[in-house]
């Protein structure tokens, strides 16, 4: 059982990376002198209480920044937010903290991240780029939900 977060870097199929801008994650083309975020991820330790066939339930944070991704409703719309939170505090909770959990599914080199709190909603970036990460349930051309996750050892 791994109980320290793993680190990874993420880009989408258009080779855009995640960058932190004013406490918001945006996807931008990789350039010189740019510092993409390093992702911290750790599997939920209560996997036996979560659905088995949707992927590996993980907490997703920004390495070294005490910020974690979470899903919350604004009005009727599930939204993706960054919250100040220690990923290990979430990991150690006595129950899964669903608002901070994502089902991580891998198909070949592609990864998707589905909200546990809002099944059917996925982390996505607009195909236009330079836009904040969002949650979407429309897995079409307007948004990219497939990401390349490279683990850093």
């Amino acid at each position: 059982k791994i109980d320290t977060p793993q680190r990874g870097s993420i880009q989408d199929i258009n080779h855009r990376v995640w960058v932190l801008q004013d406490q918001t994650l945006i996807a931008v083309p990789r350039k010189d002198r740019m510092s993409p975020v390093t992702i911290a991820l750790i599997s939920c330790r209560h996997v036996e209480t979560l659905e088995k066939d949707r992927g590996n339930p993980i907490y997703l944070g920004l390495n070294g920044l005490n910020l974690c991704l979470m899903c919350a409703k604004v009005g009727d719309q599930p939204t993706l937010q960054l919250k100040e939170k220690d990923i290990m505090d979430l990991y150690n909770q006595p129950e899964p903290v669903k608002s901070f959990l994502f089902y991580h599914s891998q198909s070949g080199r592609n990864s998707t991240f589905e909200s546990v709190a809002f099944p059917g909603w996925f982390i996505a970036v607009s195909s236009e780029g330079g836009c904040p990460l969002i949650l979407t349930q429309e897995l079409g051309k307007a948004n990219t939900t497939d990401f390349g996750l490279t683990m850093l050892f």
Partner: antibody, heavy 121, light 109 residues
Framework: EVQLQQSGAELVKPGASVKLSCTAS????????IYWVKQRPEQGLEWIGR????????RYDPKFQGKATMTADTSSNTAYLQLSSLTSEDTAVYYC??????????????WGQGTTLTVSS | QAVVTQESALTTSPGETVTLTCRSS?????????ANWVQEKPDHLFTGLIG???NRAPGVPARFSGSLIGDKAALTITGAQTEDEAIYFC?????????FGGGTKLTVL
């Protein structure tokens, strides 16, 4: 207003089964965890277990495995506790409670009013 | 299975500070036990006070605080009020199951 409304008192015979209900209003049970707790006269509380109504997955205290069965129906926003092979030891008040995460911790934030179960011939 | 022990009864006076404790038969209580504290008033009225050892539930008055004191979890009421007369239960997590204590009957005279 958030409320957990439990079914009324039950008087049942030894060996029988009973199904208690806990109906939520003001929130959706699939967005939280529902816990069941037993309180015998002049005794403390005992954790029976919990259900995640979103997926039906349960956890039981080993002591109640085989005795208690927790289920939930999200369409009626109701959680259920079934108790089988009843004996006088099952005479107690049974509570449902919401176990909710706020900000940094889980809390028991809302409780039902309790259902009194009396097992007697 | 672990046994969680609390004082059976305590008495305090209005305005005084009182501390209730919660001991584990398995050894020292730690933050990994995620102590919860619950108040029971007459007519089966339960209120969650503390979660995660020391985090006050939303809406709970600031006079209630949770902590670890020595090898036990503790609930401190700073400036007790007559309406704090109740039974207080602690609950500790052990891996994937929860164990409640027997409760402390607090009298505020």
């Amino acid at each position: 207003e958030v409320q957990l409304q439990q079914s009324g008192a039950e008087l049942v015979k030894p060996g029988a089964s009973v199904k208690l209900s806990c109906t939520a209003s003001g929130f959706n049970i699939k967005d939280t965890y529902i816990y069941w707790v037993k309180q015998r006269p002049e005794q403390g509380l005992e954790w029976i277990g919990r259900i995640d109504p979103a997926n039906g997955y349960t956890r039981y205290d080993p002591k109640f495995q085989g005795k208690a069965t927790m289920t939930a129906d999200t369409s009626s926003n109701t959680a259920y506790l079934q108790l089988s092979s009843l004996t006088s030891e099952d005479t107690a008040v049974y509570y449902c409670a919401r176990y909710e995460y706020y900000d940094s911790s889980f809390y028991f934030d809302y409780w039902g009013q309790g259902t009194t179960l009396t097992v007697s011939s | 299975q672990a046994v969680v022990t609390q004082e059976s009864a305590l008495t305090t006076s209005p305005g005084e500070t009182v501390t209730l404790t919660c001991r584990s038969s398995t050894g020292a209580v730690t933050t990994s036990n995620y102590a919860n504290w619950v108040q029971e008033k007459p007519d089966h009225l339960f209120t969650g006070l503390i979660g995660g050892t020391n985090n006050r539930a939303p809406g709970v008055p600031a006079r209630f605080s949770g902590s670890l004191i020595g090898d036990k979890a503790a609930l401190t009421i700073t400036g007790a009020q007559t309406e704090d007369e109740a039974i207080y239960f602690c609950a500790l997590w052990y891996s994937n199951h929860l164990v409640f204590g027997g409760g402390t009957k607090l009298t505020v005279l």
